[in-house]
């Protein structure tokens, strides 16, 4: 038994036929010693007398609000809730399995940007006697603060004969660092109480993995002279992180008729405009995704093809960001070839995802380690890799990136990747390895030496351990190169001489 909140207790029960249940001793919160009686819920039947009451809790009939009285006066209450465990698994009767992105997904969370603000939601078919409370932190062994509001009913839907209720909650990390590479996941815990049943649900994620931008805004069409083509332009959504030269998006533009199976024109672009072929009765739609990390695409923003009269000059804003006059090269050190680094780091992002596209859908944190791999270098908050830090002195950040590149380059050339089980022949790990080396050499020309971090002895003994470690390293590398790519894109846009 444990205390959920003041005067509310949770009894954990193994739930099987003829289970002995749990012996629970309730103590009346009073200085009185004599003449105390106990009742349950609205019943006037006296269950026992004395300052303590011992009960055997086996089923829901034994749970409820126990009250101690003296001479018709209520002294205190103790509410007992049951938490069922069947075959070693805690019950999940209150919430509905959303089955996306995998089975046993009860909580789903999304973030519109990297500010540390996120929303979680869950579904239930229960309409009454239901309460939720939400707690969150970053990390669990030394938790950092995340503040969550109250869960509220956000939608009601009819599903066949049933009604489905969606609840949601908004949370904000207390000291968010949008530009850093996360190393500890956010933990979200939801306590659910339906009548006398208690259940708890948890989710663990990095903000980068739950990013889903809002749709692009201000779609505009401009028909091109003497052509069936239309120039479509748009802007970054207002809710996306700034500056856009650092937090860049990529876009998918699609022209399609009303039917999902209709023929379509489709083009991908990093710009905020594109030229497409518009058809009668078709719509132009644009959606956005983080340019350097394969999180979710936004929902589509759409305009009908027929409305292509609202022409306007320009092609939207927000694409290159940075604006204004170019900043001088970094003080206190030679400036890297920003544009070359940008191109190579973007290639690294592509390679890191093609090296393990499915890694994104595997929950590698189930292995009991709090971070992906404890020993890999992360680009942290104090490393100066944020836009302001780069402007002040980019050398700190570049040194950190260089250390990480050397580290990962050594890891990818180590026994972890060369040993059994052999990599598939078509694995891009070889290309990834070469590109890491290429970028690190661009960052550290001859005669300029930064100290590099020691490679820990990560060599696992079993092939399955090696396979798991590969996944974790590649997953971590995806996050690392995404931050590096943002740094170089921003540098190319604002720091290039």
């Amino acid at each position: 038994i444990w205390e959920l909140k003041k005067d509310v207790y949770v009894v954990e029960l193994d739930w099987y036929p003829d289970a002995p249940g749990e012996m629970v001793v309730l103590t009346c919160d009073t200085p009185e010693e004599d003449g105390i009686t106990w009742t349950l819920d609205q019943s006037s039947e006296v269950l026992g007398s004395g300052k303590t009451l011992t009960i055997q809790v086996k089923e829901f009939g034994d749970a409820g609000q126990y009250t101690c009285h003296k001479g018709g006066e209520v002294l205190s209450h103790s509410l007992l809730l049951l938490h069922k465990k069947e075959d070693g698994i805690w019950s999940t009767d209150i919430l509905k399995d959303q089955k996306e992105p995998k089975n046993k997904t009860f909580l789903r969370c999304e973030a519109k940007n990297y500010s540390g603000r996120f929303t979680c939601w869950w579904l239930t078919t229960i309409s009454t006697d239901l309460t939720f409370s939400v707690k969150s932190s970053r990390g669990s062994s030394d938790p950092q603060g995340v503040t969550c509001g109250a869960a509220t009913l956000s939608a009601e839907r009819v599903r066949g004969d049933n009604k489905e209720y969606e609840y949601s909650v908004e949370c904000q990390e207390d000291s968010a660092c949008p530009a850093a590479e996360e190393s500890l996941p956010i933990e979200v815990m939801v306590d659910a109480v339906h009548k006398l049943k208690y259940e708890n649900y948890t989710s663990s994620f990095f903000i980068r993995d739950i990013i889903k931008p809002d749709p692009p805004k201000n779609l505009q069409l401009k028909p091109l002279k003497n052509s069936r083509q239309v120039e479509v332009s748009w802007e970054y959504p207002d809710t996306w992180s700034t500056p856009h030269s650092y937090f860049s998006l990529t876009f998918c533009v699609q022209v399609q008729g009303k039917s999902k199976r209709a023929k379509k024109d489709r083009v991908f672009t990093d710009k905020t405009s594109a030229t497409v072929i518009c058809r009668k009765n078709a719509s132009i739609s644009v959606r956005a995704q983080d340019r350097y990390y394969s999180s979710s695409w936004s929902e589509w923003a759409s305009v009908p093809c027929s409305g292509s009269g609202s022409s306007r000059g320009g092609s939207g804003s927000g694409g290159s960001g940075g604006g204004g006059s170019k900043l001088r090269a970094v003080p206190g050190g030679s400036s890297p070839a920003w544009t070359q680094c940008q191109q190579l780091s973007q290639k690294l992002c592509t390679l890191a995802w093609s090296a393990h596209p499915l890694v994104g859908h595997m929950d590698l944190r189930e292995e009991g380690d709090e971070e992906t791999t404890n020993d890999v270098p992360h680009i942290q908050c104090g490393d100066g890799c944020d836009p302001q830090g780069l402007r002040d002195n980019s050398q700190f950040c570049l040194q950190r990136i260089h250390q990480g590149l050397i580290f990962y380059e050594k890891l990818l050339g180590s026994d972890i990747f060369t040993g059994e089980p052999s990599l598939l022949p078509d694995s891009p790990v070889g290309q990834l390895h070469a590109s890491l080396l290429g970028l690190s050499q661009l960052l550290q020309p001859e005669g300029h030496h930064w100290e590099t971090q020691q490679i820990p002895s990560l060599s696992p003994s079993q092939p399955w351990q090696r396979l798991l470690l590969r996944f974790k390293i590649l997953r971590s590398l995806q996050a690392f190169v995404a931050v590096a790519a943002r740094v170089f894109a921003h540098g190319a846009a604002t720091l290039s001489p």
Partner: antibody
């Protein structure tokens, strides 16, 4: 399955015109875009243009603008590509291809060899 | 128009070896790039679309990567039926253009 069958080989004199046909089957004709791509002997591929059989919309590569006409006959599920003012460097295999996506080529015809020679 | 450049023009590889084909665009084309295989006397066949998306029915040994201006088609372990000419094609803007092709021949 989706299939495209093209007309037979042609030999033409310089200055003449040629009309190649492409009969589609295995799908609803108006549901796919149709493109024409050519390949000169021993050379690479060259895109000529596309037609939308649903409405007759066309887009031609600038190189062929004014010399090529693409049409369709929905009653027979057939597409046509006419190239006028033929020159010897128009000697090539002409392919039609179909796709639900406008910008790449999924299903190809077997090709029609057009020889331009005096 | 966007010019696509493929290298090498000819690649000599032994069966079972890995082949890496390159395609470069004259300007950034995001991931609007597609790969085709053509055997002598046959029409081309689509292998990969949008830089890395695989086609059902195409063996898993064919994979694509890249974005922006540089793209790669990798054939992990060449089979006898893979000796052919490979073309890349950009779909970023009209006119659609192809690379000059890379001939993969038996070493």
């Amino acid at each position: 399955q989706v299939q495209l069958v093209q007309s037979g080989a042609e030999v033409k004199k310089p200055g003449a015109s040629v009309k190649v046909s492409c009969k589609a089957s295995g799908y609803t004709f108006t549901d796919y875009y149709l493109h024409w791509v050519r390949q000169a002997p021993g050379q690479g591929l060259e895109w000529m243009g596309w037609i939308d059989p649903e409405n007759g919309d066309t887009e031609y590569a600038p190189k062929f603008q004014g010399r090529v006409t693409m049409t369709t006959d929905t009653s027979t599920s057939t597409a046509y590509m006419e190239l006028r003012s033929l020159r010897s460097d128009d000697t090539a295999v002409y392919y039609c291809n179909a796709n639900k996506e406008l910008r790449y080529f999924d299903v190809w015809g077997q090709g029609t060899m057009v020889t331009v020679s005096s | 128009e966007i010019v696509m450049t493929q290298s090498p023009a000819t690649l000599s590889v032994s069966p079972g070896e890995r082949a890496t084909l390159s395609c470069r665009a004259s300007q950034s084309i995001s991931i609007n790039l597609h790969w085709y295989q053509q055997k002598p006397g046959q029409a081309p066949r689509l292998l990969i679309y949008f830089a890395s998306q695989s086609i059902s029915g195409i063996p898993a040994r064919f994979s694509g990567s890249g974005s922006g201006t540089e793209f790669t088609l990798t054939i992990s372990s060449l089979q006898s039926e893979d000796f052919a000419v490979y073309y890349c094609q950009q779909s970023n803007s009209f006119p659609l253009t192809f690379g000059g092709g890379t001939k993969v021949e038996i070493k």
